[in-house]
């Protein structure tokens, strides 16, 4: 169950997709990736208040137990629900190759 | 890539499976679940230091960007990599039913 999308903390404060610009150097890829030189990294950032975008039953349980035992059980966390692929031009033993990474760019977010 | 399982923060401090005992009342299930009365909830808790149990390329990117921009990009988060099913005896409109939930108990953890 993908629960409420209304953020009680105010607009943009809850779990959602953000874009962070990063160079190959930032990512530690400069020695093995030729292109792209800069990546618009989409990632999931934000708070996960009670039942906000709860990914599944486990997330709902986590919310309940966090309310009861906040020092023991952390709140649910904002993570990718799905990904967009990304193609890199990378160095190989024989030269250069195209490689698709299916788990690189977040496409959608939920709390778990 | 499931990266290093060695926790640099000390034994038990990094992302791993924990068991938290919870009653139906704790979970808010008392009005619709008959059994079990108490659940040994397995969940993923702990820190995700650099490359510890990195789930995928996205987690590796997140680690790199968190190091560069800690106020903007959060560290990876400890979440279930897989689940164990759990059967509940629950109340229904017509009486009582067995229901299997596939996403209730964490089986394995990783950082993402």
């Amino acid at each position: 169950a993908r629960n409420g999308d209304h953020c009680p903390l105010g607009p943009g404060r809850c779990c959602r997709l953000h874009t962070v610009r990063a160079s190959l150097e930032d990512l530690g890829w400069a020695d093995w990736v030729l292109s792209p030189r800069e990546v618009q990294v989409t990632m999931c950032i934000g708070a996960c208040p009670s039942q906000f975008r709860a990914a599944n039953m486990h997330a709902q349980i986590k919310t309940s137990l966090h309310r009861l035992k906040p020092d023991t059980v952390p709140a649910p966390c904002c993570v990718p629900a799905s990904y967009n692929p990304m193609v890199l031009i990378q160095k190989t033993d024989t030269g250069v190759s195209l490689q698709t990474y299916d788990d690189l760019l977040a496409k959608d977010c939920h709390c778990i | 890539a499931r990266n290093g399982d060695h926790c640099p923060l000390g034994p038990g401090r990094c992302c791993r499976l924990h068991t938290v005992r919870a009653s139906l009342e704790d979970l808010g299930w008392a009005d619709w679940v008959l059994s079990p009365r108490e659940v040994q909830v397995t969940m993923c808790i702990g820190a995700c230091p650099s490359q510890f149990r990195a789930a995928n390329m996205h987690a590796q990117i997140k680690t790199s960007l968190h190091r560069l921009k800690p106020d903007t990009v959060p560290a990876p988060c400890c979440v279930p990599a897989s689940y164990n099913p759990m059967v509940l005896i629950q109340k229904t409109d017509t009486g009582v039913s067995l229901q299997t939930y596939d996403d209730l108990l964490a089986k394995d953890c990783h950082c993402i």
Epitope: L34, P85, G95, L98, Q99 | -
Partner: antibody, heavy 121, light 110 residues
């Protein structure tokens, strides 16, 4: 000696299909990306697509759906399957090693001599 | 879709003169660009890769420059064997990958 040799061209009717082969020798196909390019008579070059060493395929938008690139590493051969052929697909079809915009180690300029496909009724 | 646009379509140059060919990409392709020379009945011959790196066996009178969307091929002093058609090729990668050639520039004797 490193070589690329295209075959399978010829005359085909509109709406028909054809499979071109690119047999390579002198290197292990599994280690390289391979590109298909075509050239209509008296016209410019047209990029068709690439198959990577890992087997992923990438196509020009106009080629998606009609053209399929595959490879058989055991036979050291790359294929271009062309379906629903039209008169405008008449061209010389070339295979080339690598992604072309960056050089592989060793020989930088490995192209076959091309095979002519004529689509006509 | 990525589109590569070459200019001019034809360039008339005297032997010994300098020739400058342009190629523009519709997307930022960084340095994912190569230049090819082609003569009738022959496959293309790689001159420049990675926008500015001279391919092996290519004379130093050929040079490439640019990155992003604007690229240039320069032939510093045209020799008789340089009269041919020149093509640029760009490859764009992000969520997928696609390549495209420019329409070509014919370098002819003035």
């Amino acid at each position: 000696e490193v070589q690329l040799l295209e075959s399978g061209g010829g005359l085909v009717q509109p709406g028909g299909s054809l499979r071109l082969s690119c047999a390579v020798s002198g290197f292990s196909l599994s280690s390289y990306d391979m590109t298909w390019v075509r050239q209509a008579p008296g016209k410019g070059l047209e990029w068709i697509g690439i198959i990577s060493g890992s087997g992923s395929t990438y196509y020009a938008s106009w080629a998606k759906g009609r053209f399929t690139i595959s490879r058989d590493n055991s036979k050291n051969t790359v294929y271009l399957q062309m379906n629903s052929l039209r008169a405008e697909d008449t061209a010389v079809y070339f295979c080339a090693r690598g992604i072309l915009v960056y050089a592989d180690y060793g020989d930088h300029n490995l192209w076959g001599q091309g095979t002519l496909v004529t689509v006509s009724s | 879709d990525i589109v590569m646009t070459q200019s001019p379509a034809t360039l008339s140059v005297s032997p010994g003169e300098r020739a400058t060919l342009s190629c523009q990409a519709s997307e930022d392709i960084y340095t994912n660009l190569a230049w090819f020379q082609q003569k009738p009945g022959q496959p293309p011959r790689l001159l420049i890769y990675a926008a500015s790196t001279l391919a092996s066996g290519i004379p130093a009178r050929f040079s490439g420059s640019g990155s992003g969307t604007e690229f240039t091929l320069t032939i510093s002093s045209l020799q008789s064997e340089d009269f041919a058609v020149y093509f640029c090729l760009g490859v764009y990668t992000y969520i997928s990958a696609e390549g495209a050639f420019g329409q070509g520039t014919k370098v002819e004797i003035k």
